[in-house]
């Protein structure tokens, strides 16, 4: 139903917590660069208007369309030109133009310092003193450097946030109750973020049908005894749930997942037997719950769908007529039986059945045609399944660290031009996904593998599309989702490359490397290991091993050492030394 | 983890009959569809004959329908195939296979678990 005031609208719908979360979010995530306190003065005065509407549906602006409201307050900042350069210029236009102007500003890779945690005691004083300014911190700071993460899934971490902290903060030890705690969340927020980032991909690339289409599989495979129709309006729900958060329409989007999430609790009876744990929680909580609910049971006995998609002479006819629905119905017919697949790969072969039968309804036979379409899914089938057999092998065979070192070369040897640290970035991520799904049972290696790898791959493409510097990565990119990891998997070493030149400099270190984190000593070496692979494509396994194995205990020694800089400068050019005769 | 192993093959004359069975170990076998593939020596391995987990659906090559039957028995975790009217082209090494899901029951790349196979040959 129309409302005369969507701000309004919004605001009864939400709440006043929500609603200033979302603002808060969406600013955050278009002005990338304002600090907390510029953004939190126009939340607040944007609460405040909406609570004049809510009062008062005819008061004067507030019939306006929130896009307008955003906009306005936004190109209102004093000095945007200055801190934004060319985004000033969307302010000349008129919406909707002036929001999609807004949209292609937004920066996947932000000038910002990495998000530091401070130390428990800091945290917990500034947490007691003032929960919601720390909350809204925490919002501004992951929405400012994830400019597309999922709004009111962002809200619920900020609320898991708060819980772990109102936990922590009574605690003898707060540090070791809140570490791991939060290092949890942390965790699950950069996944969300990447998934998220992926769908956003999907939506602006290729549209909405792809976006359905990925829709469709999913939610077939979580509820495989739900009827098609049921599945067709899920996805359809969820596809504009998505497009809106996508497309910055914060409010809208949280809106409608907490309708979404109502619908699902209200007709628990033809979607699924596992909802009802969900359906019992708060409205944040129930809606993150039934995005990561497990899948209900398979029914037992489902036929082979060959029936229907090869062996029935119909198989053209039902084609033509409606050709949408019909691949529709196979997509959802195969992924309700094979939760054991990923979405990519359901979706690659919902394309060859499509293929096959484009080619084959043209052709004198039809049936004899197509009939041979099982044979063909095999290839697709077996190769993401070997995929997974052979990293999950090595990963158990090196452990997380050596594992993302392995594919750090494999990366680095496909696509040499990519900067170091888009690459070392890549592949720790890439590396992740054996602590990830390594770990399962076989049944959710491949989907937790491959829809993973999807959207790291995805964040690759994203980052690379801002500064295009490799053919090979661009055409990965370019060509359709779900053939990109696929492709990414077939790349071999760039021929065309030309090998840097050996720099000194990119190989000598300093006694500041012995204080660093863990964490920030592994970025370390793996950055030396991505430029020794640039300087020498071809090296072997056993030369990287080599050369890194002396660099680690070279690092070891001198952090022992008494006289840490005077190790640093002595040994160091005799290991640079060293280094270029054993890659020589 | 499931485990099949495969019995009852042997050496007949064209026109005798044999039972094979399947037993598995190691999963719930009462959540898998069964199925019997057979690779002739040279020859690529094919499908013969699968059922689905409550025995409502049964399916067969066409070289084997009508002579095949496929059954099988939850309560003792194993499946069977009587092969009536054999011929010397059924000569092979007979497979037993488990899916946990599938598609198509009649594809080898959807099954999962594998046995050592049993071989039947039929020679006068």
């Known amino acids: 139903e129309a409302h005369k005031s969507e701000i309004a609208h919004r605001f009864k719908d939400l709440g006043e917590q929500h609603f200033k979360g979302l603002v808060l979010i969406a600013f955050s995530q278009y002005l990338q660069k304002c600090p907390y306190e510029e953004h939190i003065k126009l939340v607040q005065e944007v609460t405040d208007f909406a609570k004049t509407c809510v009062a008062d549906e005819n008061a004067e602006n507030c019939d306006k369309s929130i896009h307008t409201l955003f906009g306005d307050k936004l190109c209102a900042i004093p000095k945007l030109r200055d801190n934004y350069g060319e985004l000033a210029d969307c302010c000349a236009k008129q919406e909707p133009e002036r929001n999609e102007c807004f949209l292609q500003h937004k920066d996947d890779n932000p000038n910002l310092p990495p998000f530091q945690r401070p130390e428990a005691e800091a945290m917990c004083t500034s947490f007691q003193e003032n929960p919601t300014s720390f909350l809204g911190h925490y919002l501004h700071e992951v929405a400012r450097r994830h400019p597309y993460f999922y709004a009111p899934e962002l809200l619920y971490y900020a609320e898991k946030y708060n819980e772990v902290l109102t936990q922590c903060c009574t605690e003898s030890d707060k540090a070791a109750c809140l570490t791991p705690k939060l290092d949890a969340v942390k965790e699950k927020a950069l996944v969300a973020a990447v998934r998220q980032r992926m769908k956003c991909s999907s939506m602006q690339r290729f549209g909405e049908r792809a976006f359905k289409a990925w829709a469709v599989a999913r939610m077939s495979q979580r509820f495989p005894n739900a009827e098609f129709a049921e599945i067709t309006k899920l996805a359809t729900d969820l596809t504009k749930i998505n497009k809106e958060c996508c497309h910055g329409d914060l409010l809208e989007c949280a809106d409608d997942r907490a309708e979404l999430a109502k619908y699902m609790c209200e007709n628990q009876a033809t979607i699924s037997s596992k909802l009802q744990a969900c359906c019992d929680k708060p409205v944040l909580q129930k809606s993150q719950c039934l995005a990561e609910i497990e899948h209900d049971n398979i029914p037992a006995d489902l036929p082979s769908i060959a029936a229907d998609f090869v062996e029935d002479k119909e198989v053209c006819k039902n084609y033509a007529e409606a050709k949408d629905v019909f691949l529709g119905t196979f997509l959802y017919e195969y992924s309700r039986r094979h939760p054991d697949y990923s979405v990519s790969l359901l979706l690659r072969l919902a394309k060859k059945y499509e293929a096959t039968l484009e080619k084959c309804c043209a052709e004198g036979d039809p049936p004899a045609c197509y009939g041979t379409v099982l044979a063909e899914f095999q290839p697709l089938v077996e190769e993401p399944k070997n995929l997974v057999k052979t990293n999950c092998e090595l990963y158990e065979k090196l452990g997380e660290y050596g594992f993302q070192n392995a594919i750090l070369v494999r990366y680095t040897q496909k696509a040499p031009q990519v900067s170091t640290p888009t690459l070392v970035e890549a592949a720790r991520n890439l590396g992740r996904v054996g602590t990830k799904c390594c770990t399962l049972p076989e049944a959710q290696r491949l989907p937790c593998v491959e829809d993973y790898l999807s959207a790291i791959l995805n964040r690759l493409c994203v980052l690379h599309e801002k500064t295009p510097v490799s053919e090979k990565v661009t055409k990965c990119c370019s060509g359709s989702l779900v053939e990109r990891r696929p492709c990414f998997s077939a790349l071999t070493v760039d021929e065309t490359y030309v090998p840097k030149e050996f720099k000194a400099e990119t190989f000598t270190f300093h006694s500041d490397i012995c204080t660093l984190p863990d964490k920030e000593k592994q970025i370390k070496k793996q950055t030396a290991l991505a430029e020794l692979v640039k300087h020498k494509p071809k090296a072997t396994e056993d030369q990287l091993k080599t050369v890194m194995g002396d660099f680690a205990q070279f690092v070891d020694k001198c952090c022992k050492a008494a006289d840490k800089d005077n190790c640093f400068a002595t040994e160091g050019p005799n290991l640079v030394a060293r280094s270029k005769e054993a890659l020589a | 983890e499931v485990q099949l192993v495969e019995s009852g093959g042997g050496v007949v004359q064209p026109g005798d009959s044999l039972r094979l069975s399947c037993a598995a170990s190691?999963?719930?076998?009462?959540?898998?569809?069964m199925g019997w593939f057979r690779q002739a020596p040279g020859k690529e391995r094919e499908f013969v004959s699968a059922?689905?987990?409550?025995?409502?659906?049964?399916y067969y090559a066409n070289s084997v329908k009508g002579r095949f039957t496929i059954s099988r028995d939850n309560s003792k975790n194993t499946v069977y195939l009587q092969l009536n009217s054999l011929r010397p082209e059924d000569t092979a090494l007979y497979y037993c296979?488990?899916?946990?899901?599938?598609?198509?029951?009649?594809?080898?790349?959807?099954?999962?678990?594998w046995g050592q196979g049993t071989l039947v040959t039929v020679s006068s």
């Open positions: 190691g999963g719930t076998f009462s959540t898998y569809v």
């Open positions: 296979a488990a899916s946990r899901f599938t598609s198509w029951y009649t594809a080898d790349y959807e099954y999962d678990y």
């Open positions: 059922i689905s987990q409550n025995s409502i659906h049964t």
